[in-house]
């Protein structure tokens, strides 16, 4: 998920006098913005850890890889990267860790070649539904995005303004069906409690989906059926208790899939029988020999692959008349 980079020795820093001398004129084609490093040979501009509060206006037209990490951007307004002439070559944009809390509709408009976008490690309390689609039409022009990295974008709990964070993110992913070509989606470390059921069906080109380190309890209402190209599904470090038959069958039906399930609190009772049977037969789960029970207490740390049906019992539920106080 990282973009190509170039060695620091090939970068030229902007001269302060140059920046001020041309501030009132259109940018020169090979100009480097103040506080950035530029390599025309590598088509790369790095404005990293410079406390920038706005996207530089004078980005060179040749830029293909733009790193704007570790800044103080706060807001990405509409057309934040719109330039005349446009940044027609810009393919990889990394905005991680730049204290963004608001991304407005059309923030990435006029970037016809943008394939990789990384917004990780920004507390996105206000992500417009039209941040990626650019318009509120029911069907927007297709986005060129192929890779969207949204790891750890959840704001602090008291800053979510009583809205569903999952819902806000999914609205941005689905608006206008603009992201039909998306192949990689990373949503790790976002405290997701659930995955809205329609999200995957509308991202049919996905090859890699990372949902690790969330708080997903169940996949019962999530369908993977349409994701025929899916190659990797990361579900490590969630709160999954069991995978049911429907999910198991759908995963087994995906031709290229590898699933990662480590570090979930599996509940090894009678409901786990189907999953254990499936695990013993399937090749799709990576590191399946590492999966262990968390509950009930008597089963803690037992390896799932070593269980048999006799191990997987459920305590009988007494009818109300037989229950004692």
């Amino acid at each position: 998920s990282s973009s190509p980079t170039s060695s620091a020795s090939s970068f030229s820093s902007s001269a302060p006098f140059l920046a001020s001398a041309v501030s009132a004129q259109p940018p020169l084609p090979d100009q480097c913005p103040a506080l950035c490093e530029c390599s025309e040979a590598a088509r790369t501009v790095k404005c990293v850890n410079r406390n920038l509060t706005e996207v530089p206006t004078d980005l060179p037209a040749y830029v293909r890889n733009l790193f704007l990490t570790g800044n103080q951007l706060a807001v990405l307004p509409a057309g934040a990267f719109a330039r005349r002439p446009p940044l027609a070559e810009l393919a990889a944009l990394n905005l991680s860790g730049s204290r963004l809390d608001e991304v407005r509709a059309g923030a990435f408009e006029h970037l016809p070649s943008l394939r990789q976008l990384d917004l990780s490690h920004n507390p996105l309390a206000d992500l417009s539904p039209f941040a990626f689609s650019g318009s509120n039409a029911s069907v927007s022009a297709p986005s060129p995005l192929v890779e969207l990295i949204l790891n750890h974008i959840v704001p602090p709990e008291d800053e979510r303004q009583n809205r569903s964070f999952e819902g806000m993110v999914v609205a941005a992913l689905l608006a206008g069906r603009a992201l039909q070509g998306l192949r990689r989606l990373e949503l790790a470390s976002n405290h997701f409690l659930y995955l809205p059921r329609d999200v995957l069906a509308q991202l049919p080109s996905l090859r890699h989906l990372d949902l690790s380190n969330n708080s997903l309890v169940s996949l019962t209402y999530v369908s993977f059926r349409n994701l025929t190209h899916l190659e990797s599904l990361h579900l490590e470090d969630n709160a999954l208790k069991v995978l049911h038959n429907g999910t198991l069958a759908e995963l087994q039906g995906l031709p290229h899939i590898r699933v990662f399930l480590d570090n979930n609190p599996w509940v090894c009772d009678c409901h786990m029988a189907d999953m254990v049977t499936w695990l013993k037969e399937t090749e799709v789960v990576q590191g399946k020999d590492r999966l262990t029970c968390a509950y009930p207490e008597k089963m803690r740390n037992r390896v799932l692959l070593e269980l048999n049906s006799a191990d997987l019992d459920c305590d009988p539920i007494l009818p109300p008349s037989l229950q004692t106080s």
């Epitope: 807001v75 204290r99 963004l100 704001p155």
Partner: nanobody
Framework: QVQLVQSGGGLVQAGGSLRLSCAAS????????MAWFRQTPGKEREFVAA????????RYTDSVKGRFSISKDNAINTVYLQMNSLKSEDTAVYYC???????????????WGQGTQVTVKP
């Protein structure tokens, strides 16, 4: 409308320090940015520093960079301006402000504190 109540300020020798506080009566979700401005007689209010409530992004006018520091305490809806290495040209009435934008113009801010005098003796 949110009420902004300022405290701090006063008279200080050049090279000294002061801390200003600005407490919001409630945390307005519509006001995403808190800022400090200053004004000297006959001049327009000048932007000094700003901070975002959520992301904590900060920005400063060039003349105070490295000397002033803006911070916030979300739990008590309060913003601070720590002013070090004060110069006589920092003498002004300082105002805190709340607004939606991530801007440096006073028109970006809708709610204002009452102002507090800072005087730096040469």
């Amino acid at each position: 409308q949110v009420q902004l109540v300022q405290s701090g300020g006063g008279l200080v020798q050049a090279g000294g320090s002061l801390r200003l506080s600005c407490a919001a009566s409630r945390r307005p979700f519509s006001s995403k940015t808190m800022a400090w401005f200053r004004q000297t007689p006959g001049k327009e209010r000048e932007f000094v520093a700003a901070v975002r409530w959520i992301g904590g992004a900060t920005r400063y006018t060039d003349s105070v960079k490295g000397r002033f520091s803006i911070s916030k305490d979300n739990a008590i809806n309060t913003v601070y301006l720590q002013m070090n290495s004060l110069k006589s040209e920092d003498t002004a009435v300082y105002y805190c402000a709340a607004g939606q934008a991530w801007g440096t113009k006073f028109t970006d801010y809708s709610d204002w504190g009452q102002g507090t005098q800072v005087t730096v003796k040469p």
